[in-house]
């Protein structure tokens, strides 16, 4: 903490301006009024203060607002935001999307810091749900944001917000997250026609059940192998050779290159070898003639 010392004669700050960069830390503490600082926070960002000087300015605001800063100050924190701890941020009540954007801008280009994570958490909890505008903003700054949320947190995303999601936003999502997002996407895009619907739903198909994949196989969608490889194993296993052939269309030839990988490998093992042979791809490992084909649903009964 900076010691309390009297402000030297003639040095009392009348406004926040560049002259303050020549003030020593103790002079800033003694000569800058916290209330003046709060009303002129927007000027701080334009002045090249040192980190030590910014520490003093933060200290003055902390003294003025021990219960947490008001949004009028938060919105203009600028680089002073980088000095805030998660504990500081937990005292805030941020409701304006503009405030959120202003602070995210400060951290732009960097990984999500604990401060930013706390800020987002406070903002979203304050709103009660992840609305479209918020999701738009967050994924613009952090494409992986959606996949950083737990399935429980994702459940608060309204289907209308799904329109804001881009394919790259789902790149790091795991199966449990896609299980939550897929039904929302299905609902959001339900009024689109076949080909347009497939374009939109494609990124979410890692959460699709077997019956939806069977339905898609009847629509000439020509799913690419990259999408097929991201499907749930339990959703792929019940598909017949004919259904997979229809689902993939001309991309069915790509199965050969993926035959050692999941879920293709598991699917191959559950098909009759005769059926696999009809694809003409040389896929091996299917069930030989004469063997009983066991359904996955028999798992409980058999074990």
């Amino acid at each position: 903490e900076v010691e309390k010392t009297a402000c030297p004669s003639g040095k009392k700050a009348r406004e926040i301006d560049e002259s303050l960069i020549f003030y020593k830390k103790w002079e800033l503490e003694a000569c800058v009024d916290a209330a003046l600082l709060a009303t002129q926070m927007d000027r701080v960002n334009a002045i090249p203060f040192t980190y030590e000087q910014l520490d003093v300015l933060k200290h003055k605001l902390d003294e003025l607002y021990p219960q947490g800063y008001p949004e009028s100050v938060i919105q203009h924190l600028g680089y002073l935001f980088l000095k805030m701890s998660p504990e500081d941020i937990r005292k805030w009540n941020v409701t304006s999307l503009e405030t959120l954007k202003a602070l995210l801008e400060v951290n732009k280009g960097h990984e999500m810091s604990p401060q930013v994570a706390t800020l987002i958490d406070r903002f979203v909890k304050g709103r009660g749900q992840l609305d479209k505008d918020t999701l738009d903003t967050l994924t613009a700054f952090y494409p992986g944001y959606l996949c950083s949320l737990s399935p429980e947190e994702l459940s608060s995303v309204p289907p209308s917000s799904i329109w804001a999601v881009r394919p790259q936003d789902l790149d790091t999502c795991d199966p449990r997250q896609l299980d939550v997002l897929y039904p929302k996407a299905r609902l959001a895009f339900q009024n689109m026609n076949g080909s347009e619907y497939f374009v939109k739903i494609q990124s979410f198909l890692g959460g699709a059940p077997t019956e939806d994949l069977k339905a898609l196989s009847q629509q000439n969608v020509s799913m690419d192998l990259a999408t097929f490889m991201k499907l749930r194993t339990d959703a792929v296993l019940p598909l017949t050779v004919a259904e997979v052939q229809k689902l993939l269309g001309p991309h069915v030839e790509g199965l050969k290159a993926e035959e050692r990988h999941r879920p293709v490998r598991d699917w191959i093992l559950r098909q009759r070898q005769d059926d696999l042979d009809t694809l003409g791809l040389g896929l091996q490992g299917g069930i030989p003639n004469g063997y009983l084909v066991l359904d996955l649903s028999m798992q409980e009964a058999l074990s």
Epitope: M229, L269, Y291, L302
Partner: antibody, heavy 119, light 107 residues
Framework: QVQLQESGPGLVKPSETLSLTCTVS??????????WSWIRQPPGKGLEWIGY???????NYNPSLKSRVTISVDTSKNQFSLKLSSVTAADTAVYYC???????????WGQGTMVTVSS | DIQMTQSPSSLSASVGDRVTITCRAS??????LNWYQQKPGKAPKLLIY???SLQSGVPSRFSGSGSGTDFTLTISSLQPEDFATYYC?????????FGGGTKVEIK
């Protein structure tokens, strides 16, 4: 509940064939939901997957051991077996049999059996 | 074949600590990543499958995350019974591979 139990000789001479059997109780090797694997662990070292078999007889082996390994299944006895030929001291390890649930991982393991290769 | 690299190879921690173990695959394995716990003289035990799903009966202090090539196992508050060796394992490729293991010891 499903249990796995390994059995076989604890000592094998170099150049001979190591033979182990895993008996499944409380479940069936004929289930379409599982792969039946062998995994080994040399003393003080990490885990090495040897291979698996599916009820249909389809097998998949570790490429570094493929030329020496055979895994087979006997559905009538509810067992699956491992044969590893031309063994050397480097094959000394605890050998585990394990069930792999296709939707998860190796969810059930045998308690393991120590096999020493020595003359 | 796909190499699985675990870090650290060992760590010392106290009861109540938050512990994080990472596993990196040499190529993308989607979410086909499992975590196991092994205690001396015992068979490994499945903790987490499909990168983030908790195996039935495993305490909720264990959690997993990641997809593609980078994965994490977290123990939120280390308990005395958690001192063991932890292994990651990929099942994306037909040639299954394990990480080298991370030994969690008492500080």
């Amino acid at each position: 509940q499903v249990q796995l139990q390994e059995s076989g000789p604890g000592l094998v001479k170099p150049s001979e064939t190591l033979s182990l059997t895993c008996t499944v109780s409380g479940g069936s090797v004929s289930s379409g939901s599982y792969y039946w694997s062998w995994i080994r662990q040399p003393p003080g070292k990490g885990l090495e997957w040897i291979g698996y078999i599916y009820y249909s007889g389809s097998t998949n082996y570790n490429p570094s051991l493929k030329s020496r390994v055979t895994i087979s299944v006997d559905t009538s006895k509810n067992q699956f077996s491992l044969k590893l030929s031309s063994v050397t001291a480097a094959d000394t390890a605890v050998y585990y049999c394990a069930r792999e649930d296709v939707l998860s991982g190796f969810d059930i393991w045998g308690q393991g059996t120590m096999v020493t290769v020595s003359s | 074949d796909i190499q699985m690299t675990q870090s650290p190879s060992s760590l010392s921690a106290s009861v109540g600590d938050r512990v994080t173990i990472t596993c990196r695959a040499s190529q993308s394995i989607s979410s086909y990543l499992n975590w196991y716990q092994q205690k001396p003289g015992k068979a490994p035990k499945l903790l987490i499958y499909a990168a983030s799903s908790l195996q039935s009966g495993v305490p909720s202090r264990f959690s997993g995350s990641g997809s593609g090539t980078d994965f994490t196992l977290t123990i939120s508050s280390l308990q005395p019974e958690d001192f063991a060796t932890y292994y990651c394992q990929q099942s994306y490729d037909a040639f299954y591979t394990f990480g080298g293991g991370t030994k969690v010891e008492i500080k």
